[in-house]
Interface confidence: low
């Protein structure tokens, strides 16, 4: 239906508290550079323009659209030339041009500093103050680095921080109450922000089509009792919410959201038998509940898939009446009989059904021809599940830190160009893995290793995108996404790539090293070790485990040594040589 | 456990008054920010009200300034919300939030003003 005007409408809907934590998101994902005050004074401007339309819909500019009222917002911010360069170029153009140029200038990695998390008690004295403003600035910090992420999961994560702190803030012990909560809260976040990422990749590169045939797949398994109309149905409006959220129109994007949760929750019946406990829930916790639903049960008497799509004489002619329709069909089908696969792997397989029904239903004889094409899934199937069994065999030999510079290293080796910090950072996200999906039960770690590998390489590709500097990665992340972690798998050490000439300063430490969290010690030892893969990239694991292990050692010995700086001046250049001997 | 339980809805006519309390039990209630918030039938949640641990600093909607008073008991633990000049968009079910909640786990009390 029509609103008279779309801001008071979805004012209306979301409730100030939402409407205000959604436009907050919004600004900061699209200007990122700006502060949390300069923000949240255009929200409280935002938030009493909207007010206004609410009390009389017919007030001047409450009609215009909010790409209109939220873009004429930004282009009025002071210095935007100076702070954002080419962006303000956007604020030449009329919508829908000017949004678009907006989506194009957002930053997957802007240059802020990491996001730090004060001390307990500092955190909880401003939380107690202000908690509005608290978790504004919370808002605002997660939702300039993470420009896609979905804005109503982050209202989630937001009132799970708000919970732990109300829980934490009033304990004697707080540091220990809030760490590990919050640090879980943290995981589950950037793990949100990457899968989001990937779902907005889709839909930008490929189109509405590509996204909903992921969103039939996924609702395939989770929901296998629903009928065929129930899942599309489903996957329509799930496509719509996700499009709305990539292309910055959050207040939609949430409102939608919102009325999915509970349509699935008055149709329990014709979806499935396990939504009960979520729709028990306020709003948020509801929405996000719904989104990891666990799988319902599949019925017991269903067919085999060849029935209806290899057996039958129609296949070509239902194919021919309705492509689309019969491929969503067949991906359904095979889904829902597959919650052990990855949605990735579901994909590939309906991609090479409909390539297979469009060779073979040219043909003459074409069931003959098609007669064999679940045979022809096999080696698809087979790749993926070796993957996973060799990969988690690895991790629990070698640890979530082990593992980690094992990707490390066979990564550097494939992509050698590729900046030694996103090798980094991409190789302890990828070895996260292990720990996420490998203690699962067998018929769980295959979607989740491969749907978690597929939305990790997309950021890879996303941050090579900027600056391309390697071939095998470009060839990689230019094919589909579904085919990505398998070329990636694929990959094997580029043999056009001159090794870089070895500089002892870059495996010159100092006595600072000592005192860095644990993660941040990792680091430093993992980018000597994309360094040195850099240095030679043919050095065997033996070679550059006994540099790693007497690089360690080095480590171990100076920190415990009495005069730290001494012992690193003085050991350093002995290891330096002791490394080129090493791999020489 | 956390709880808080509202109390003291009701009917009452346009341009009179209520005062709604809500009681909280398993957390240090001085050391927290309070909140009052509404949601009218098939409407959003609309945020009505804050105030400090101490009670020293209060906040309202445009929509409910200078008809509303938040007010707190740290003694008791005891949340209030005086309404004054009630009006028939103010029904609602109003519900208590610890700390700027952006949603309530709590039942809530349901305020109808009407005529």
């Known amino acids: 239906e029509a609103h008279k005007s779309e801001i008071a409408h979805r004012y209306n809907d979301l409730g100030e508290q939402h409407f205000k934590g959604l436009v907050l998101i919004a600004f900061s994902q699209y200007l990122q550079k700006c502060s949390y005050d300069e923000h949240a004074k255009l929200v409280q401007e935002v938030t009493d323009f909207a007010k206004t339309c609410v009390a009389d819909e017919s007030a001047a500019n409450c009609d215009k659209s909010l790409h209109t009222l939220f873009g004429d917002k930004l282009c009025a911010i002071p210095n935007l030339r100076e702070n954002y360069g080419e962006l303000a170029d956007c604020c030449t153009k009329q919508e829908p041009e000017r949004n678009e140029c907006f989506l194009q200038h957002k930053d997957d990695n802007p240059s802020l500093p990491p996001f730090e998390r004060p001390e307990a008690e500092a955190m909880c004295t401003s939380f107690k103050e202000n908690p509005t403003t608290f978790m504004g600035h919370y808002l605002h910090e997660v939702a300039r680095r993470h420009p896609y992420f979905y804005a109503p999961e982050l209202l989630y994560y937001a009132e799970q921080y708000n919970e732990i702190l109300t829980q934490c803030c009033a304990e004697a012990d707080k540091e220990s109450c809030l760490t590990p909560k919050l640090d879980g809260v943290k995981e589950k976040a950037l793990v949100s922000s990457v899968r989001q990422r990937m779902k907005c990749s889709s839909m930008q590169k490929f189109g509405e089509r590509a996204f909903k045939a992921w969103a039939v797949a996924r609702l395939s398994q989770t929901f296998p009792n629903a009928d065929f109309a129930e899942i599309t149905k489903l996957a329509t409006d799930l496509t719509k919410v996700n499009k709305e959220c990539c292309h910055g129109d959050l207040l939609e994007c949430a409102d939608d959201r919102a009325e999915l949760a509970k349509y699935m929750c008055e149709n329990q019946a014709t979806i499935s038998s396990k939504l009960q406990t979520c729709c028990d829930k306020p709003l948020l916790k509801k929405a996000h509940c719904l989104s990891e639903v666990e799988h319902d049960t599949m019925p017991a008497d269903l067919p085999a898939i060849a029935a209806d799509f290899v057996e039958d004489q129609e296949v070509c002619k239902n194919y021919a009446e309705a492509k689309d329709v019969f491929l969503g069909t067949f991906l359904y089908e095979y889904s829902r009989r597959h919650p052990d696969y990855s949605v990735s792997l579901l994909l590939r397989l309906a991609k090479k059904y409909e390539a297979t029904l469009e060779k073979c239903c040219a043909e003459a004889n074409p069931p003959a021809c098609y007669g064999t094409v679940l045979a022809e899934f096999q080696p698809l199937v087979e790749e993926p599940k070796n993957l996973v069994k060799t990969n988690c065999d690895l991790y629990e030999k070698l640890g979530e830190y082990g593992f980690q510079n094992a990707i490390l290293v066979r990564y550097t080796q494939k992509a050698p160009q590729v900046s030694t910090p996103t090798l980094v950072e991409a190789a302890r996200n990828l070895g996260r893995v292990g720990t996420k999906c490998c203690t699962l039960p067998e018929d769980q770690r295959l979607p989740c290793v491969e749907d978690y590998l597929s939305a990790i390489l997309n950021r890879v590709c996303l941050l090579h995108e900027k600056t391309p500097v390697s071939e095998h990665v470009t060839k990689c992340c230019s094919g589909s996404l579904v085919e990505r972690r398998p070329c990636f798998s694929a990959l094997t050490v580029d043999e056009t790539y001159v090794p870089k000439e070895f500089k002892a300063e870059t495996f010159t430490f100092h006595s600072d090293i000592c005192t860095l969290p644990e993660k941040e010690k990792q680091i430093k030892k993992q980018t000597a070790l994309a360094e040195l893969v850099k240095h030679k990239p043919k050095a065997t694991a033996e070679q550059l485990k006994t540099v790693m292990d007497d690089f360690a050692q080095f480590l171990d010995t100076c920190c415990k040594a009495a005069d730290k700086d001494t012992c690193f001046s003085t050991e350093g250049p002995n290891l330096v040589t002791r490394c080129k001997d090493a791999l020489a | 456990k956390v709880q808080l339980l509202e109390s003291g809805g009701g009917l009452v006519q346009p341009g009179g008054s209520l005062r709604l309390s809500c009681a909280a039990s398993g957390f240090t209630f001085s050391s927290f920010g309070m909140s009052w918030v509404r949601q009218a039938p098939g409407k959003g949640l609309e945020w009505v009200s804050s105030?400090?641990?101490?009670?020293?600093?209060?906040l309202y909607a445009d929509s409910v300034r200078g008809r509303f008073t938040i007010s707190r008991d740290n003694s008791k633990n005891t949340l209030y919300l005086q309404m004054n000049s009630l009006r028939p968009e103010d029904t609602a079910v109003y519900y208590c939030?610890?700390?700027?909640?952006?949603?309530?786990s709590s039942q809530g009390t349901l305020v109808t003003v009407s005529s």
């Open positions: 939030t610890i700390g700027g909640s952006l949603s309530p």
């Open positions: 105030i400090s641990g101490s009670g020293s600093d209060t």
